[in-house]
């Protein structure tokens, strides 16, 4: 007679990533007798929240519970009822929330305080909700791509189990880009880190990692724009601004104080004559990239060498994944091709800068028109960011791997986060076992 | 203290418009969102709306939505609500409330001192 | 729109007197329910929140009670300063709404 499957033994975890543009909830799946294992973890879920970051329901916390209602019934769904209690829930914010305690540790508090009473209501473990430092959220974005690509196995294979692998244990660099910050970190080649905030050391299965990680708040790419209109309207002669990081036709009304609101622009704000401007596009991506580059100081470093603001970075060693928001947009412009070089980048984006509004319009008539207006503000941002801010050249541009998802997880912080808080990563390698037999009888 | 203190009373014909300010002292602004409330005269009270002194997000009962504008100096901590094209049934007092968060929910806890907006031609 | 009900529009009592003054909201709107004084020609005070929590600084005498459809406000020990409007408001649900107010007259 077959054999038959006896019912599997496995556990769940939920992490949800409160991002300073929406909130998204990930369900995590691993055999329970594998704990220990590197790789063993993978996504089986992931549910965007409708709606804005938790940052964005100041004055209206009353509505958060409402807000997470459908992801969270949706992991009641995915997850077996008999698993609910065991299965631990984690969430973790990000940036938006870093500005808004900022600006007031109470409102901050208050929305936490609101999250944690919603969540506390499913029938899950929940481990709480807390604002991680940028430091955390570019080292679990570290651990989670090495992960999933395998690099913390001390077994070598003959063969690639994911793209990217180059068959080494050389870890590969993680490069995140939010709304309201963006992440570095890697492994510097013998190189000392000169700054003791940026220097992260993990003994991982049994290896030490000496990790280089810096967080820059107020430039992901939702704040960078913020701050960069803060800049150009300083110097505009009246309440219109003419941008070359929008598109040729291109119009939109802006609220100077709605501009002023981040703490990201205090340093730009000014009192002006007008309360509205409208920014009017023109398309060019060469004074677009020249406006951004303003945003970047580089004439103070108290270091060997820095990225910009006078914060200390390495040289770039090894390969690096550049995910989230750098995945997403590349991948809207169609430049996440390995085989596309960074000059190539260039040209794309010059003339995807240059194409009238309208025209864009209808190519792309499915997309919001908010999020359609700014891919030539963001691509270029990213180009800019890459090369400028953190000195990747066109040779090394080939290094960078833009990722969404490996092995079918997302690429991002959640899963190390989850990782970590469940102790799945030990610190010595675990004493191999002799396979199981117990999945069938 | 905390204080909400409102334009004075405004005297308008028919198809005018009208700003009352609402100037907030004693509190940090953006932290706490502005209600607006109509009484007529001889009547209760008519919740008109509420405006997020922090993200600039409006909201409008049914009843206020098209004539009714609700905005913001936020560097004058102060709150304006507008209304278009006067008809005499909007002759009524204007009040301004502060809408603050209180075990679990948002009340009004402050209040106005009113504007009287008369409309006659 | 739930409807908040005050079936009394006016009341009549005396110094030193205990009255209650009632509300019916048309839906559960659980405890989210406020009620305010205004005296004539000023502005609603806030009294109760929640149903029955007092605001700092308003008396003692003052007290809330109910949940769901049925809320009452009582004053025991009635003061001539008491002589106002008292008007029940549900925000529980946009879009807010305020009962038609109770009279309180002191004889």
């Known amino acids: 007679t077959q054999n038959k499957a006896l019912p599997e033994n496995v556990k769940y975890g939920i992490v949800l990533d409160a991002g300073s543009s929406h909130t998204s909830l990930y369900i995590y799946k691993w055999p329970a007798e594998k704990e220990n294992d590197t790789g063993v973890v993978h996504q089986v879920e992931e549910c965007r929240v409708k709606g804005p970051g938790i940052s964005k329901f100041v004055q209206k916390v009353n509505e958060i519970g409402i807000y997470l209602t459908d992801c969270m019934e949706r992991a009641r769904e995915v997850i077996p009822r008999s698993q609910h209690q065991e299965t631990p829930v984690y969430l973790g914010a990000t940036a938006g929330m870093r500005l808004l305690r900022m600006e007031s540790e109470e409102l901050a508090d208050r929305v936490l305080d609101v999250v944690e009473r919603s969540l506390s209501n499913y029938p899950f473990d929940f481990q709480g909700a807390r604002i991680i430092t940028g430091q955390e959220e570019g080292a679990y974005g570290w651990i989670t791509i090495n992960y999933l690509l395998g690099k913390f196995s001390q077994k070598t294979r003959w063969f690639s189990i994911v793209p990217y692998e180059t068959n080494n244990q050389e870890t590969f660099g993680a490069l995140d880009l939010g709304g309201a910050s963006t992440q570095v970190t890697f492994v510097p080649q013998n190189q000392t880190i000169e700054s003791p905030d940026n220097a992260l050391q993990f003994r991982l299965y049994g290896k030490d990692y000496n990790v280089y990680t810096h967080s820059f708040l107020c430039y992901g790419k939702d704040q960078a724009l913020w701050q960069k209109l803060a800049k150009d309207i300083q110097v505009a002669s009246n309440e219109i601004l003419r941008d070359p990081c929008f598109h040729p036709g291109y119009k939109k009304v802006v609220n100077v104080s709605d501009l002023y609101k981040t703490p990201c622009t205090k340093r730009f704000e000014m009192t002006l004559p007008f309360q509205q401007f409208e920014i009017q596009g023109i398309g060019n991506y060469q004074q677009c990239h020249q406006s951004i580059l303003e945003l970047f100081n580089t004439s103070y470093c108290p270091y060997s060498q820095c990225a910009f603001n006078g914060i200390f970075l390495p040289p770039l060693q090894g390969d690096f994944g550049a995910f989230s928001a750098f995945y997403f947009v590349m991948k809207f412009l169609n430049l996440t091709s390995e085989k596309v070089s960074q000059e190539k980048v260039t040209e794309m984006m010059k003339k995807f800068c240059a194409q009238p509004w309208e025209e864009i319009k209808t190519s792309y008539a499915g997309v919001k028109e908010k999020y359609l207006s700014e891919y030539c503000f963001s691509g270029t941002y990213i180009l800019s960011l890459l090369l400028q801010g953190y000195h990747f050249t066109a040779d090394s541009w080939e290094h960078i791997h833009f990722i969404g998802k490996i092995q079918g997880s997302d690429a991002g912080w959640t899963l190390g986060y989850m990782l970590n808080l469940t102790n799945m990563i030990p610190a010595e390698q675990p004493l191999s076992t002799p396979l199981s037999h117990s999945t069938y009888v | 203290q905390i204080q909400l203190v409102q334009s004075g009373p405004e005297l308008k014909k028919p198809g005018e418009t009208v700003k009352i300010s609402c100037k907030a002292s004693?509190?940090?602004?953006?932290?706490?969102?502005m209600n607006w409330v109509k009484q007529a005269p001889g009547k209760g009270l008519k919740w008109m709306g509420w405006?997020?002194?922090?993200?600039?997000?409006?909201t409008y009962a049914d009843d206020f939505k098209g004539r009714f504008a609700f905005s913001l100096e936020t560097s004058a901590s102060t709150a304006y609500l507008q209304i278009n094209n006067l008809k005499n049934e909007d002759t009524a007092t204007y009040f301004c409330?502060?809408?603050?968060?209180?075990?679990?929910?948002?009340?009004?806890?402050?209040w106005g001192q009113g504007t009287s907006v008369t409309v006659s031609s | 729109d739930i409807v908040m009900t005050q079936s009394q529009k006016f009341m009549s009592t005396s110094v030193g007197d205990r009255v209650s003054v009632t509300c019916k909201a048309s839906?559960?709107?659980?405890?989210?329910v406020a009620w305010y004084q205004q005296k004539p020609g000023q502005s609603p005070k806030a009294l109760i929140y929640?149903?029955?929590y007092r605001y700092s600084g308003v008396p003692g005498r003052f007290t809330g009670s109910g949940s769901g459809t049925d809320f009452t406000l009582t004053i025991s020990n009635v003061q001539s300063e008491d002589l106002a409007e008292y008007f029940c408001?549900?925000?529980?649900?946009?879009?807010?709404?305020f009962g038609g107010g109770t009279k309180l007259e002191i004889k």
């Open positions: 409330a502060r809408r603050a968060y209180y075990r679990y929910d948002y009340v009004m806890d402050y």
């Open positions: 004693g509190y940090t602004f953006t932290h706490y969102g």
């Open positions: 405006i997020n002194t922090y993200t600039g997000e409006l």
């Open positions: 839906h559960n709107v659980g405890t989210n």
């Open positions: 929640s149903a029955s």
């Open positions: 408001h549900q925000y529980n649900n946009y879009p807010y709404t």
